[in-house]
């Protein structure tokens, strides 16, 4: 079936990192420079992915494969294949219009992308806080009042490293 | 095959607010980012704003900053642009455009939306 | 902000080149696209990322960009590509810029 095939369809023995070149009677031709097949059979290789801007060289274009790009630093990735490049913001803050915002009172962010989220509500779930939260940190939920009976083993609670973080908007 | 639809042709008093609305079919909504371009009459294109709904920040040009918001609702596809404080240079045809996902190419545009602002 | 700067117009005869330039400090350090824009119509993409091409768009049209200088080439022009063109340029960010725009009038 495959050497049918190839009677058939000469491009189908040209390999990734070439094209079928109907200029030259469907020999198989490397790629040119800047550009890439990642598959066997094509008749036209791609133009490789350039970093510019913002963007950086993760991995180089090769003649089978594209480029790859990240972000600066100071930057993060967004979307499939790093499509867009996103400033980024310290923990305890989220990117708003007018740029890097705390997070407020009630919320927190654990990373550098992303939105202050609020911290999570430990009474409905019948536990108690543990830990205080911060900008930075969901509260820490431990058990309920009620577990912490007189014979129960109890864990007390550390005292918050500092105040919960607050900030007016 | 992608199609952007925009809400229909407004007309508005200076100082009030207007929001239009475009709604994506027959593509991936949430990780495309979605900007909005606005054209006076006889004039150039002028890019206000972005947003990408799966992430929800939006970004906006300079000029825009405090008087424009884009939201997105991922729930139906559809991306919004409200303007407010308007006034008769607000007067103009505003289009919503889709990014190609790894490039920085707009290549699918709303049929866009004139938007007059009269007294 | 990146500011971009087309010519208001130029003139080609049937069949001849049309060379469009938008230049910008720096402007290669960025990705270029291009727009053609017909009276009443939207924008279309004819070419993306400095000098790629859009299915479906003729290969007569290319697109080059370097030092501050990104080009617009339309080689055998014909009557249809008589319209507006925009250079828009893109830093990876959710944030872009348009030039002035170029009405292209062929002779």
């Known amino acids: 079936f495959e050497r049918t095939r190839s009677l058939q369809d000469p491009c189908s023995n040209c390999p990734a990192g070439t094209f079928c070149d109907n200029n030259r009677n469907q020999i198989c031709s490397p790629c040119p420079p800047n550009s890439f097949s990642s598959a066997g059979g094509q008749r036209t290789c791609d133009i490789c992915r350039q970093c510019k801007g913002v963007f950086r060289t993760r991995k180089e274009c090769s003649s089978t494969s594209n480029a790859e790009c990240d972000c600066t630093p100071g930057f993060h990735c967004l979307g499939a294949g790093c499509s867009m490049c996103e400033q980024d913001c310290k923990q305890g803050q989220e990117l708003t219009k007018k740029g890097c915002k705390d997070c407020c009172f009630g919320t927190f962010n654990d990373q550098k992308r992303g939105i202050c989220r609020p911290w999570t509500n430990c009474s409905l779930d019948g536990k108690s806080v543990l830990v205080n939260g911060t900008k930075e940190r969901d509260v820490v939920c431990g058990p309920s009042p009620a577990d912490l009976s007189p014979g129960a083993s109890s864990v007390t609670p550390p005292a918050p490293a500092r105040e919960p973080g607050h900030s007016p908007q | 095959q992608v199609q952007l639809v925009q809400s229909g042709a407004e007309v508005k008093k200076p100082g009030s607010s207007v929001k239009v609305s475009c709604k994506a079919s027959?593509?991936?909504?949430?990780?495309?980012?979605i900007s909005w371009v606005r054209q006076a009459p006889g004039q150039g294109l002028e890019w206000m704003g972005g947003?990408?709904?799966?992430?929800?920040?939006?970004n906006y040009a300079q000029k825009f900053q405090g008087r424009v918001t884009i939201t997105a609702d991922e729930s139906t596809s559809t991306a919004y642009m409200e303007l407010s404080s308007l006034r008769s240079e607000d007067t103009a045809v505003y289009y919503c455009?889709?990014?190609?996902?790894?490039?920085?190419?707009?290549?699918?545009w709303g049929q866009g939306t004139l938007v007059t602002v009269s007294s | 902000d990146i500011e971009l700067t087309q010519p208001p117009s130029v003139s080609v005869a049937p069949g001849q080149t049309a060379r469009i330039s938008c230049s910008g400090d720096?402007?290669?350090?960025?990705?270029a696209s291009w727009y053609q824009q017909k009276p009443g119509q939207a924008p279309v993409l004819v070419i993306y990322?400095?000098?790629n091409r859009p299915s479906g768009i003729p290969e007569r049209f290319s697109g080059s960009n370097s030092g501050n200088t990104a080009t617009l080439t339309i080689s055998g022009t014909q009557a249809e590509d008589e319209a507006d063109y925009y250079c828009?340029?893109?830093?990876?960010?959710?944030?872009?810029?348009f030039g002035g725009g170029t009405k292209l009038t062929v002779l």
């Open positions: 990322d400095d000098s």
């Open positions: 828009q340029t893109w830093d990876g960010t959710l944030h872009f810029v």
């Open positions: 947003i990408i709904p799966g992430f929800g920040t939006a």
């Open positions: 720096n402007l290669g350090d960025y990705y």
């Open positions: 027959g593509g991936t909504f949430n990780s495309y980012a």
């Open positions: 455009a889709r990014k190609n996902e790894e490039d920085g190419g707009f290549d699918h």
